[in-house]
Amino acid sequence: IPPHVQKSVNNDMIVTDNNGAVKFPQLCKFCDVRFSTCDNQKSCMSNCSITSICEKPQEVCVAVWRKNDENITLETVCHDPKLPYHDFILEDAASPKCIMKEKKKPGETFFMCSCSSDECNDNIIFSEEYNTSNPD
């Protein structure tokens, strides 16, 4: 950090490595929860027009696809992978692509993905060819 920039105590808004290099924040689609027409497709675009700067540099992009008897929704956000989201760990946070994995949620079909390249949650991928691990 440059000498004229104060380093505050307990600052999670800036992440540095051992050499003092600074991590830039992620750019993610961030529309929270929106109704979606994405269904039975290998991949979908988020149709979210808002690309936001994540508040903290350690945050990654997340997408959550949910289907129940009434509707389908797609949620796009930034989130810290050290913290669970919807009670699930973001195990794929280092991935450059948002590869959807099914999670067990009663009463609905629930898929979630996370990734760490710019706007990577704009293109959500359900295709089996990308999934190398079993869903939870």
Epitope: I1, P2, A21, V22, F24
Partner: nanobody, 124 residues
């Protein structure tokens, strides 16, 4: 020598406007994503806005969306931040910085060179 020189800060009343400038030299301006970053007194850095080198795609933190507008003039090697509807919580030192698009980390602890910053104080 790489230089980033911010200007345009000052004292403004809540609801007022300011336009910050950042004059860049010593590097190929059109190769870099440019950022405005701010630091409020006693607080950490907040990433305010960014703009792509070509095509002028822009990005904003949620806290400033709809109030701030980032722009750049590649012919003048200058970055701008138009700040409207200013609030007390916008009081901070504002820095510009440069990033090679796609690179996650700066090359060194000087954020690929910072400017010295310009102080914005929003107070009645």
């Amino acid at each position: 020598e790489v230089q980033l020189l911010e200007s345009g800060g000052g004292l403004v009343q809540p609801g007022g406007s300011l336009r910050l400038s950042c004059a860049a030299s010593g590097f190929t301006f059109t190769e870099y994503r440019m950022w405005w970053v701010r630091q409020a007194p006693g607080k950490g850095l907040e990433w305010v806005s960014a703009i792509e080198p070509i095509g002028n795609r822009t990005y904003y933190a949620k806290s400033v969306t709809g109030r701030f507008t980032i722009s750049r003039d590649n012919s003048k090697n200058t970055l701008y931040l138009q700040m409207n509807s200013l609030r007390a919580e916008d009081t901070a030192v504002y820095y510009c910085a440069k990033q090679i698009p796609g690179r996650k980390w700066t090359a060194n602890s000087r954020f690929d060179y910072w400017g010295q910053g310009t102080l914005v104080t929003v107070s009645s």
